[in-house]
């Protein structure tokens, strides 16, 4: 998930040279930007979130807000400061004319301004309920730990907290920030107002139909009786959670956001801040049968984004739409005809569908995992959710063709035991946004702050790419893929792993002069090879084939085309051991795979040779996939021969630590 690559509308209003009477001019050369929702009907012009630079203090935020009001008044405009943000993001929420945007963008400390927009409950039909008999049986499901050490915050509609399913489990906070309902004839019927939130609270912690039956919940009302809210209301809700956390630190916190709006830079930024404060955020991918990266908070990289599947593990269709998909989705979960508490009566049940229900399942699973292991970080939790998911059960034909490779084929499941997974080396695959088609376009994939980038690969549907390389950015390694002339764009694919006490570096060999090809190995004592990348400047690598198999006794070596620079990811970590596994096919084939065996984790995936008919390589769970151009276009020349190279690792140190715990 890449929040910076979201497809949203950005209007950059250039700063004029005159200072318009400001006491402090903005820093030289910086331009504050204006953002608004790309989905026109969801825009809420007239209300703006003014986000200030990171270090801005509350007093400066208040001063900036007052300055805006004063300058607006001088121009004859009325403004109203609705909220001053602090705790998560510095800034303020202002009601004003759009005519004042240029003025506001020139204020000191302003980073960017975002027009407010709508967010929506992600269940269908959440107010056209199909009532099931008021009895529901879940005799089989008796979880080992009901999530009793965890508090789950639910940002949703109002809820009926004394429903038998959730009585005593949900504390309704006094937080409420919702827009007026649409329509003059709207009739506020309590049971409908509570429908969405009550159902989701039941899915998370309901006594009969809940996932984490022991979890306690707190609800914040950010959606009105029509299931509609605002980005600003959600932001203020997230800020409320952060302040509550600071005032009264408790155990692990999970925040469930069963809502979606258009891509929002500010909502994603707030989610990032809260996640970095140790809170686990789980959100609905959205019910728009679209790329989840176009929606927020689904597109926030730090949030666990959940798509919906049905009882047959197929993506959920919701009327003419359905679950969102794509690289911003972390995993899927049950989201069709989910039985849960109905606000129609205190013992009623109803089935609802949508990515909200799927997200509620994952929030419940997360609560149980955190209750069993309260010290888990967000990165560790996400890796475990992925690790314990059912793999490759979703029929990908439902997704648009260009999204299939990007969408994780994972359906959330409870771990067989909530303990004892500590020994595993966990890795996941992170896809970048598409680079775009320009000649010099690049795409960047990054790992989470406490994950290690162990390898980097690239993929292009046209095959026109110039490989990939690992490079340092802000003190962390990132994976960058390069487009080639005439290419339709590339993806960078990062393999992100949990490797405590790791010390990783990249060793590079420039293109070789000799015809033997380029080689690079890990020469530092105790460092093992975790991944190989290759990058070339030439538009089209020739048909030169390096020797595919490494010389014996050279497992720590990357081999590549002589015209390519080769990059080896070399890591030192306690007990880390890795081995190279290759699968070569002499005849041309569209896909070659090689998998790591039980107990080993795939850290690196690359292709040999790196010639132009190879579209790229990427990891799917523990399998390295190398894709080549359509056989019919390649012909059956020897150039068609491709080898998939997997690097499989395990950590004896983690295994020992786990055994000692047991």
């Amino acid at each position: 998930q890449e929040d910076e690559d979201g497809d949203y509308e950005e209007l950059v209003l250039a700063l004029r040279s005159e200072e318009d009477g400001l006491a402090e001019a903005p820093e030289h050369g910086t331009t504050a930007t204006f953002h608004r929702c790309a989905k026109d009907p969801w825009r809420l012009p007239g209300t703006y979130v003014v986000v200030l630079k990171e270090e801005t203090h509350l007093s400066q935020s208040e001063r900036t807000a007052r300055r805006l009001q004063a300058q607006a008044a001088r121009r004859g405009y009325l403004t109203k400061i609705l909220h001053v943000f602090h705790g998560l993001l510095p800034g303020f929420l202002v009601k004003m004319s759009g005519d004042l945007l240029e003025l506001a963008l020139k204020l000191p400390h302003v980073d960017y301004i975002e027009e407010d927009s709508s967010v929506f409950a992600q269940s269908i039909p959440w107010n056209l309920e199909r009532i099931t008999p008021p009895r529901y049986r879940a005799d089989e499901y008796q979880p080992p730990d009901g999530g009793s050490l965890v508090e789950v915050y639910l940002l949703d509609t109002s809820i009926q907290s004394d429903h038998r399913e959730i009585e005593g489990r949900v504390m309704v906070t006094d937080f409420e920030n919702v827009p007026e309902e649409d329509g003059t004839r709207f009739h506020r019927q309590a049971s409908k107002c509570d429908s969405h939130g009550t159902h989701l609270a039941g899915v998370v912690s309901g006594r009969d139909a809940g996932v984490a039956k022991g979890a306690s919940m707190r609800s914040l009302r950010v959606l009105n009786c029509q299931g509609k809210g605002t980005v600003s209301g959600t932001l203020i809700g997230l800020e409320f959670i952060r302040k509550s956390q600071l005032v009264q630190p408790v155990g692990p916190l999970v925040v469930l956001l069963p809502l979606a709006g258009g891509y929002s830079r500010v909502l994603n930024a707030a989610c990032q801040r809260l996640a970095r404060a140790g809170v686990v955020l789980v959100t609905a991918a959205g019910n728009f049968r679209d790329d989840a990266c176009l929606y927020s908070p689904a597109s926030a990289p730090e949030v666990i984004t959940v798509g919906a599947t049905n009882a047959q593990d197929q993506p959920v269709t919701l009327g003419t739409l359905g679950t969102n998909f794509g690289r911003c989705v972390d995993l899927f979960a049950p989201g069709e005809d989910i039985i849960g508490a109905s606000s129609d009566c205190s013992t009623c049940f109803v089935s609802q569908s949508g990515t909200s229900q799927a997200a509620a399942h994952v929030a419940g699973i997360a609560a149980m995992m955190l209750s069993a292991e309260p010290e888990l970080t967000l990165a560790e939790l996400r890796q475990r959710l992925i690790h314990f998911s059912a793999k490759d059960v979703i029929n990908e034909a439902w997704f648009p063709e260009d999204q299939r490779v990007l969408t994780p084929n994972l359906v959330a499941a409870l771990p067989p035991s909530t303990h004892g997974a500590g020994w595993q080396l966990f890795c996941r695959t992170v896809w970048s946004a598409h680079s775009g088609p320009t000649r010099m376009a690049t795409a960047v994939a990054r790992c989470a702050p406490d994950e290690e980038l162990l390898s980097c690969s690239s993929f292009s549907r046209s095959g026109k790419r110039r490989g990939e390389r690992m490079e340092a950015q802000g003190g962390k390694l990132v994976c960058r893929a390069h487009n080639a002339f005439g290419g339709e764009g590339v993806y960078a694919i990062a393999r992100c792993c949990l490797l405590p006490q790791a010390n990783c570096s990249v060793h590079t060999a420039p293109p070789a002069e000799a015809s033997m090809g380029t080689r690079v190995h890990c020469h530092q004592q105790g460092h093992v090879l975790t991944g190989c990348s290759s990058h070339w400047e030439v538009e089209d690598l020739g048909t030169h084939k390096p020797p595919v198999l490494r010389p014996r006794g050279q497992p720590n070596q990357c081999v590549g085309h002589r015209e390519a620079s080769i990059h080896a990811s070399c890591c030192h970590a306690p007990g880390l051991e890795c081995k190279v596994k290759e699968h070569g096919i002499p005849a041309p084939q569209e896909q070659v795979t090689v998998a790591c065996e039980e107990g080993w984790t795939l850290t690196g995936c690359s292709a040999l040779p790196g010639t132009s008919h190879v579209l790229g390589a990427y990891a799917v769970d523990n399998t390295c996939v190398v894709r080549s151009r359509d056989v019919s276009t390649t012909g059956s020349t020897s150039e068609g021969a491709v080898t998939a190279v997997a690097i499989c690792c395990r950590s004896r140190h983690l295994a020992q630590a786990s055994q000692e715990l047991q």
């Epitope: 049986r137 907290s161 004394d162 005593g168 489990r169 013992t347």
Partner: antibody
């Protein structure tokens, strides 16, 4: 601490009505409804119904339908149970208890129906 | 309605005895069963919640077990203050229903 405090004993004539109150304290009242349970002299316990502090929803036992009304006043955290057309077999101790789980009980209110 | 059948209806025991009371539901109630102790002129007091969970303040000599339709309340070593009437109650479905009670008397 969590407490349910009920109103005092009542003596009523057959055909009259009685209204028993139950004041809740020490917890978030909207997180639980109130159940009413009665116990005739020397007999067992009988659940009469449930009422919501949150929205006033009710769930009555069939036996009570039509004669009993349960209400709440969230502003004072008080629940009420009114029983109309009293008969001698309504003589009992009436208890309020928290939620459906009946984990906390009031001290009981004795209602005597006698001509 | 779900019927709850308690046995025995009364028993005589001495201080220090191990006492077992059983409760059977007419249909599966999962583990949504509570046990109460009631002394004359007093309100029932919750002893066991959800078939086996002992609330804070309830002595450890009281324990509950069972799930589905068959449940047991055990007093491992009867104390003088334990002589009372014990009720089981299901809250799996409404109406909530009680067993007829078991009176524990001094032998």
């Amino acid at each position: 601490q969590v407490q349910l405090v009920q109103s005092g004993a009542e003596v009523k004539k057959p055909g009259a009505s009685v209204k028993v109150s139950c004041k809740a304290s020490g917890y978030t009242v909207t997180s639980y409804g109130i159940s009413w349970v009665r116990q005739a002299p020397g007999q067992g316990l009988e659940w009469m119904g449930w009422v919501s502090f949150y929205n006033g929803q009710t769930n009555y036992a069939q036996k009570l339908q039509g004669r009993g009304t349960m209400t709440t006043d969230p502003s004072t955290s008080t629940a009420y149970m009114e029983l109309r057309s009293l008969r001698s077999d309504d003589t009992a101790v009436y208890y309020c208890a928290r939620g459906y789980s009946l984990d906390v009980w009031g001290q009981g209110t004795t209602v005597t129906v006698s001509s | 309605d779900i019927q709850m059948t308690q046995s025995p209806s009364s028993l005589s025991a001495s201080v220090g005895d191990r006492v077992t009371i059983t409760c059977r539901a007419s249909q599966n109630i999962n583990n949504w069963l509570n046990w109460y102790q009631q002394k004359p002129g007093k309100a029932p007091k919750l002893l066991i919640y959800g078939a086996s969970t002992r609330p804070t303040g309830v002595p450890s000599r009281f324990s509950g077990s069972g799930s589905g339709t068959d449940f047991t309340l055990t007093i491992s070593s009867l104390q003088p203050e334990d002589f009372a009437t014990y009720y089981c109650q299901q809250w799996d479905d409404t109406p909530n229903t009680f067993g007829q009670g078991t009176k524990v008397e001094i032998k």
